[in-house]
């Protein structure tokens, strides 16, 4: 990995197994402030392969809610408007970091946590299993 | 929003501020133990709107490596393996949570930061304007 | 925001060749598929050619189709359109764009969110 050299006003760390506990501001910057708005709002439904999106909601995560994709078919949806079963509709996954309330309820003290989500769906070829 | 119960064990916090600065556990728990590490390993290449995954590294941002997806093709593969430019590939994003080191080059101090991701693309039915 | 820059138009002699630039600052330029447009005197903006975010793939005008090229470098933040076999009526303002919307085709002007200030080509027959 890449060496950082280290900055002389960074706050202490007591631990032995630093940095396991790290100290994290929960104000959020957000990098996306010229991103389009509209940028995929309506993707889900104009797909060949759409997707619903559900709600889940965890009030000892944060975020307490992500959204979940679920392809609404297993074929794609072909040029006349009709499930073409030759192709596959799949939900494209991601791991994401999340922060898990530790002990449970505390409202200051998280573990890091990977989660895997479903974030849209897209349309693909199946893989063919010829049966000799 | 839910009120959680507050756990006695819980850390003290003396920030009034509370809780914009926490403790966070960096051994991460991963809850996909039992996913398939190939889940979705080749849909880059056998989807319609097929697309490239590129490596973004920085080392003062926790995860330091993140894969940003870039699609291949400003149309979708038809049947016959041709881009077909009635149709268009979009990429699809969200918005993840990060670690950003602050103040810089500090082990074991951070802020949460939003980012927006491209994860991979879909095949969209592209909106047709009509001019008067 | 994101800044395009374009530069290498000057006047060319019919059956020329020219390669404009474009050089994009500010946000992450490989986000984005790029695009370049003309503009003749009295004439409506009109698509010229596009690229893929990944670079792999271009479509181009008809008018255009075998004569320019469209590349991009991400290392160096830049698109070009290599122009061969010049004609006097390609002369016109050429603009670059990117495109962060995708609510429409690759063509159609309105998805193109951000724009250079253009560069002057000129085909003397």
């Known amino acids: 990995g890449i060496t950082i050299p280290r900055n002389p006003g960074c706050p202490n760390s007591e631990d032995k197994n630093f940095p396991r506990t790290v100290m994290v501001n929960l104000n959020i910057h957000n990098r996306n402030t010229n991103t389009n708005p509209k940028r995929s709002s309506d993707y889900y439904n104009r797909s060949t392969s759409p997707w619903n999106l559900h709600r889940n909601e965890d009030p000892e995560r944060y975020p307490s809610v992500i959204w979940e994709a679920k392809c609404r078919h297993l074929g794609c949806i072909n040029a006349d408007g009709n499930v073409d079963y030759h192709m596959n509709s799949v939900p494209i996954q991601q791991e994401i970091l999340v922060l898990r309330r530790e002990p449970p309820h505390c409202p200051n003290s998280f573990r890091l946590e990977k989660i895997l989500v479903s974030v849209g769906c897209t349309c693909v070829t199946p893989i063919v299993h010829h049966v000799a | 929003g839910i009120t959680i119960p507050r756990n006695p064990g819980c850390p003290n916090s003396e920030d009034k501020n509370f809780p914009r600065t926490v403790m966070v556990n960096l051994n991460i728990h991963n809850r996909n133990t039992n996913t398939n590490p190939k889940r979705s390993s080749d849909y880059y290449n056998r989807s319609t709107s097929p697309w490239n995954l590129h490596r973004n590294e920085d080392p003062e941002r926790y995860p330091s490596v993140i894969w940003e997806a870039k699609c291949r093709h400003l149309g979708c593969i038809n049947a016959d393996g041709n881009v077909d430019y009635h149709m268009n590939s979009v990429p699809i994003q969200q918005e993840i949570l990060v670690l950003r080191r602050e103040p810089p080059h500090c082990p074991n101090s951070f802020r949460l930061e939003k980012i927006l991701v491209s994860v991979g693309c879909t095949c969209v039915t592209p909106i047709v304007h009509h001019v008067a | 925001e994101v800044q395009l820059v374009e530069s290498g138009g000057r006047l060319v002699q019919a059956g020329g060749s020219l390669r404009l630039s474009c050089a994009a600052s500010g946000r992450t330029f490989t986000s984005y598929p790029m695009g370049w447009f003309r503009q003749a005197p009295g004439k409506e903006r009109e698509f010229v050619a596009a690229i893929s975010m990944s670079g792999d793939d271009a479509a181009y005008a008809d008018f255009v189709r075998g004569r320019f090229t469209i590349s991009r470098d991400d290392a160096r933040n830049t698109v070009y359109l290599h122009m061969t076999s010049l004609k006097p009526e390609d002369t016109a303002v050429y603009y670059c764009?990117?495109?962060?919307?995708?609510?429409?085709?690759?063509?159609?002007?309105?998805?193109?969110?951000?724009w250079g200030q253009g560069t002057q080509v000129t085909v003397s027959s």
């Open positions: 764009a990117a495109r962060t919307s995708y609510d429409g085709t690759y063509d159609y002007i309105d998805d193109y969110s951000y």
